[in-house]
């Protein structure tokens, strides 16, 4: 799903207040709900009719450093006989997410939000057929 | 997928540098890759064999203010005849994502990262059958 543009209003102080110095803001240390965890069924990526694999990207100057991307294994979907049915489509499900980028020069460390497109998994879709004239 | 614990090292300065004052850091204004967009097909949530609905939650003190959650429409999956097949399962696909929480007291505005669990869509899964003795 889409993350709207900041419009630079969310991070601004109220109009009656002095502006933020140097184009930066105060980010408190610590993460709210840090212990919250995904509770997805085990092996969902292998048991789905539109199965997928995971690829891990790693960047030590990004939080989270590990970002996992899914790739659909097939063009079609897997039927009850375990065979690929190309009349159906394995389609990626994407999500816009935020990460934090760390930038440092010597002891001066600053952070910036970055938008990342993550493919979270795949779903099986019945396409509408059109015959082109 | 899971976001690891901060371990409070990512946001720390190198050991040889003076510590961050007041437990906060500098967050630069602006978002990297802000114009990046999800390119998911229209109506994927209706054409899927494990269809889902969307619910929008809105919070003006969160960025993004709008967070969209998916809910699977059925327990089973939709077969080629358009009927629900309860021998298969519609299963939510979840993703841990970061949002920014805004906290203000008068003209003092600070921000904090928050972890949010988002259900992005649903996939159709073949259940493992166990007969309990």
């Amino acid at each position: 799903r889409k993350i709207p543009k900041v419009g630079h209003t969310f991070f601004q102080k109220p109009e009656s207040c002095p502006p933020v110095p140097g184009g930066s803001m105060k980010l408190d240390i610590g993460i709210i709900n840090e212990n919250q965890r995904v509770s997805m069924s085990r092996n969902i990526e292998s048991r789905s009719t539109s199965p997928w694999n995971y690829t891990v990207t790693w960047d030590p100057n990004r939080y989270p450093s590990e970002v996992v991307q899914a790739q659909c294994r097939n063009l079609g979907c897997i039927n009850a006989q375990g065979k690929e049915d190309i009349s159906m489509n394995s389609v990626p499900i994407q999500q816009e997410t935020l990460v934090v980028r760390r930038k440092h020069q010597g002891c001066s460390v600053s952070f910036q939000l970055e938008k990342v497109l993550v493919t979270v998994g795949c779903t099986c879709v019945t396409p509408v057929i059109h015959h082109v004239q | 997928r899971k976001i690891p614990k901060v371990g409070h090292t990512f946001f720390q300065k190198p050991e040889s540098c003076p510590p961050v004052p007041g437990g906060s850091m500098k967050l630069d204004i602006g978002i990297i890759n802000e114009n990046q967009r999800v390119s998911m097909s229209r109506n994927i949530e209706s054409r899927s064999t494990s269809p889902w609905n969307y619910t929008v939650t809105w919070d003006p003190n969160r960025y993004p203010s709008e967070v969209v959650q998916a809910q699977c429409r059925n327990l089973g999956c939709i077969n080629a005849q358009g009927k629900e097949d309860i021998s298969m399962n519609s299963v939510p696909i979840q993703q841990e994502t970061l949002v920014v929480r805004r906290k203000h007291q008068g003209c003092s505005v600070s921000f904090q990262l928050e972890k949010v669990l988002v259900t992005v869509g649903c996939t159709c899964v073949t259940p493992v059958i166990h007969h309990v003795q």
């Epitope: 790739q71 063009l75 389609v91 | 097909s41």
Partner: nanobody, 116 residues
Framework: EVQLVESGGGSVQAGDSLRLSCAAS????????FGWFRQTPGKEREFVAG????????EYANSVKGRFTISRDNAKNTVDLQMDSLKPEDTAVYYC?????????WGQGTQVTVSS
Amino acid sequence: EVQLVESGGGSVQAGDSLRLSCAASGRANSINWFGWFRQTPGKEREFVAGIRWSDAYTEYANSVKGRFTISRDNAKNTVDLQMDSLKPEDTAVYYCVLDLSTVRYWGQGTQVTVSS
């Protein structure tokens, strides 16, 4: 509306090569995959080859594996099917298919005839 223009069909001898091309135009954005099916009289259309747009992942029917190669040109919205070591049983009408995940477009087809 989406248009598909197929080209490259014709008549060849067994063992020869042919190259089919398909160009998509119109509202052909958010491509999922692009590929080819074929049909012989009295039989169902069968999948031949497909290529995923995002990462160039390819799939082939067992009957053409090692002989046919599918490739794509993202900039031009085209897909090519290089058919080598053709056999008489490859004789069919070949249909270009453009898949946009929830909608699938079929071309009008181009005849390939392989004689022994």
